[in-house]
């Protein structure tokens, strides 16, 4: 039994890191393998992650971690019974994929303005709380070409757009994702989408 693709890990910079790897053949990850991990810190202890299958030869492990800080470094040991298959390390702050924003809501009752709000996925004491920026994707269910992205580069988790920038009388969907420039993170997954019917009063033409 050998590791074909070494584990690569990504952290949510809060409490979970996800490591994926591939073996050289079909493997029952949960019965044959264990991933041991330990924070390099005086008061830490070793933990064991039981991997799950991720395709025939692929394995994935969800590591429960202490609250992350930038200096953290974890040792990783992949075992098959008594055999050490791979040894490595992982700095969560260097491989961050933020959590997806939640609670996306479209408020349509503000005088021909659409107000989209969502929740920051981090608690206020987490470093990323004040460092996330967002991308909001709005698209028409009726017209695949009517697809737009709004970049929200300020900290407030909201976006205002004029209802008239979208077509009236049809349904739209929106979703939002996050990233943090400070740690050069990847984008989060998209939030669940939310749907609304766009309608607004056309202004009277004056002749």
């Amino acid at each position: 039994m050998k590791v074909l693709q070494e584990p690569t890990c990504v952290s949510d910079y809060m409490s979970i890191s996800t490591c994926e790897w591939k073996m050289n053949g079909p493997t029952n990850c949960s019965t044959e393998l264990r991933l041991l991990y330990q924070l390099v810190f005086l008061l830490s202890e070793a933990h064991t992650c039981i991997p799950e299958n991720n395709g025939g030869a692929g394995c994935v492990c969800h590591l429960l971690m202490d609250d992350v800080v930038s200096a953290d470094n974890y040792t990783l040991d992949l075992w098959a019974g008594q055999q050490l298959l791979w040894k490595g390390s992982f700095k969560p702050s260097e491989h961050v994929k933020p959590r997806a924003p939640g609670n996306l809501t479209v408020h349509t009752n503000v005088s021909d303005t659409l107000l989209l709000t969502w929740s920051n996925p981090y608690p206020p004491d987490n470093y990323l709380y004040n460092h996330l920026t967002y991308a909001v994707n709005i698209w028409s269910e009726n017209d695949p070409a009517d697809f737009r992205i709004y970049n929200v580069t300020y900290l407030e988790p909201s976006l205002r757009i004029a209802a008239s920038t979208l077509k009236s009388g049809i349904s739209y969907r929106a979703r939002v994702r996050a990233w943090a420039q400070c740690y050069n993170t990847t984008w989060s997954e998209w939030s669940p989408s939310t749907k609304w019917h766009n309608s607004y009063r056309e202004p009277f033409e004056q002749h």
Epitope: S15, F41, L42, L43, S44, E45, M65, D66, D67, V69, S70, A71, D72, P123, P124, D125
Partner: antibody, heavy 115, light 109 residues
Framework: EVQLVQSGGGLVHPGGSLRLSCAGS????????MFWVRQAPGKGLEWVSG???????NYADSVKGRFTISRDNAKNSLYLQMNSLRAEDMAVYYC?????????WGQGTLVTVSS | EIVLTQSPGTLSLSPGERATLSCRAS???????LAWYQQKPGQAPRLLIF???SRATGIPDRFSGSGSGTDFTLTISRLEPEDFAVYYC??????????FGQGTKVEIK
């Protein structure tokens, strides 16, 4: 908002005992190492003890064998049991949350050791 | 045992002036594990700088940290009235694992 609220300080005779408490809120207590740091009157800061998320502990040589740090994650609480207290233990004791450094501190509680 | 020595013991300056505080370690300290705190009378310390040069949340940009190895510096570019306090450096490393410098008092001239 992160809060660390301390209690349990007071006056004790040399050789006596005291238990300090620190209640945490506004964060996931169980995922954080916790510490005690003290400051004698007019002096600098001195690390006393730390406890990891899994219960591993460490002590400054000056308190080893006399002080015991513990935590109750169900109650979001940190404790310091101080026995065989000496005059040199007199200080303001702070609980702190952190790891390599301490971003969050309690308000401090004064322990006076005097006959 | 790593000993942190801060200098000067007291710094007498006027508001608007630049303050430069030194922290010297008896042996090399990882930059990742060097921090600076501010403490005012009757208050708990407040983290200013971690990782030798990263500002903690909510700390004004007039505070900056630098250095590596055994020599570290905290600089306050323009002293504000609320900056007059005692400043401590702190390291995490070998036994004892957490140690503080003895402090530098920044007082009004």
């Amino acid at each position: 908002e992160v809060q660390l609220v301390q209690s349990g300080g007071g006056l004790v005779h040399p050789g006596g005992s005291l238990r300090l408490s620190c209640a945490g809120s506004g964060f996931t207590f169980s995922r954080n190492a916790m510490f005690w740091v003290r400051q004698a009157p007019g002096k600098g800061l001195e690390w006393v003890s730390g406890i990891g998320t899994g219960g591993a502990t460490n002590y400054a040589d000056s308190v080893k064998g006399r002080f015991t740090i513990s935590r109750d994650n169900a109650k979001n609480s940190l404790y310091l049991q101080m026995n065989s207290l000496r005059a040199e233990d007199m200080a303001v004791y702070y609980c702190a949350r952190g790891r390599y450094y301490f971003p969050w501190w309690g308000q401090g509680t004064l322990v006076t050791v005097s006959s | 045992e790593i000993v942190l020595t801060q200098s000067p013991g007291t710094l007498s300056l006027s508001p608007g002036e630049r303050a430069t505080l030194s922290c010297r370690a008896s042996q090399s300290v990882s930059s990742s594990y060097l921090a600076w705190y501010q403490q005012k009378p009757g208050q708990a310390p407040r983290l200013l700088i971690f990782g030798a040069s990263s500002r903690a949340t909510g700390i004004p940009d007039r505070f900056s940290g630098s250095g590596s190895g055994t020599d570290f510096t905290l600089t306050i570019s323009r002293l504000e009235p609320e900056d007059f306090a005692v400043y401590y450096c702190q390291q995490y490393g070998s036994s004892p694992p957490w140690t503080f410098g003895q402090g530098t008092k920044v007082e009004i001239k």
